[in-house]
């Protein structure tokens, strides 16, 4: 059957933890992505940012998991209003910011 939203969110959080702790070299060769507003619609915005990083196997699972939280199909080059289009940050920092925010959402019971 389908995975409960709370389980899916916890699994996404744990995957982000794995990414942050397994950094030997700069994550995704130091690739830069658009920063996002961590508000409603954040999952799609996060996916839209990360999907533009190609050839980085470390975040492929994260991209797949985020797609499960986003109700519409996301493709490279697609941007929503949630992006802070004048600010780019390294993927590693993006993941850390996203992780902390998701942990707070989990605490608040916002699983979707």
């Amino acid at each position: 059957g389908p995975v409960p939203p709370s389980t899916a969110l916890r699994e996404l959080i744990e995957e982000l933890v794995n990414i942050t702790q397994n950094q030997k070299a700069p994550l995704c060769n130091g690739s830069m992505v658009w920063s996002i507003n961590l508000t409603a619609g954040m999952y799609c915005a996060a996916l839209e940012s990360l999907i533009n990083v190609s050839g980085c196997s470390a975040i492929e699972k994260t991209q797949r998991m985020l797609s499960g939280f986003c109700p519409h199909k996301v493709s490279a080059g697609q941007f929503s209003s949630l992006h802070v289009r004048d600010t780019k940050i390294e993927v590693a920092q993006f993941v850390k910011d996203l992780l902390l925010h998701l942990k707070k959402l989990f605490r608040e019971g916002q699983f979707n």
Epitope: I13, L99, L100, K104, R107, E108
Partner: antibody, heavy 122, light 108 residues
């Protein structure tokens, strides 16, 4: 100012009961989760129990489950801990603690009482 | 149940940086809080949600949480920082709050 004041501690024999109380003032008591934390002499902190803001949920440490009961009266801004079948290992300073209430009671403890000493001894 | 492991003691000279660790399985997936407790006093919150600092706590105190280790860092340590420090998380699998065993910080 915001304050938590515990009372009810003392010396009690093993197997007997004791009821601790905590009076809250200076903040909106009914909007916070409330916990009891204890500290045996010379030892570390041990979480004991939590009750949600509206009293709808309670959780207990395994070491006290079935013996201790946490309750609250939001109309009187009081928190209680009924301790039954007390054991020597329950000897500790008991702190009343406040934590903002979310879906999970995973918030930090941002206000502590000064504690009340409970000694279980024959 | 979830276990948090802290070193029993850490010693540091005044003005140096103290690092206190808190280990737990994938602790990075949980929000970590840190408390300072001086002898005969109630604990005081010094870091919450991994790295946030209450307004009354000096900027010398900071926190991080990556992988299996959370860290409390105290820069430019002062004699007044000598205390016991405890980490804490909520264990969502058991609905229990969990404390580490505590670390005694000694300022040499």
């Amino acid at each position: 100012q915001m304050q938590l004041v515990e009372s009810g501690g003392g010396v009690v024999q093993p197997g007997r009961s004791l009821r601790l109380s905590c009076a809250a003032s200076g903040f909106e008591f009914r909007t916070y989760g409330m916990h009891w934390v204890r500290q045996a002499p010379g030892k570390g902190l041990e979480w004991v129990a939590v009750i949600w803001d509206d009293g709808s949920n309670t959780h207990y440490a395994d070491s006290v489950k079935g013996r201790f009961t946490i309750t609250r009266d939001n109309s009187k801004n009081t928190l209680n801990l009924q301790m039954n079948s007390l054991r020597a290992e329950d000897t500790a300073v008991y702190y009343c603690v406040r934590a903002p209430q979310w879906y999970l009671t995973a918030e930090a403890f941002d206000l502590w009482g000064q504690g009340t000493m409970v000694t279980v001894s024959s | 149940s979830y276990v948090l492991t802290q070193p029993p003691s850490v010693s540091v000279a005044p003005g140096e940086t103290a690092t206190i660790t808190c280990g737990g399985n994938l602790i990075g997936a949980r929000l970590v809080h840190w408390y300072q407790q001086k002898p005969g006093q109630a604990p005081v919150l010094v870091i919450y949600d991994d790295s946030d600092r209450p307004s009354r706590i000096p900027e010398r105190f900071s926190g991080s949480n990556i992988g299996n280790t959370a860290t409390l860092t105290i820069e430019r340590v002062e004699e007044g920082d000598e205390a016991d420090y405890y980490c804490q998380v909520w264990d969502y699998s058991s609905d229990h709050m969990v404390f580490g065993g505590g670390t005694k910080l000694t300022v040499l």
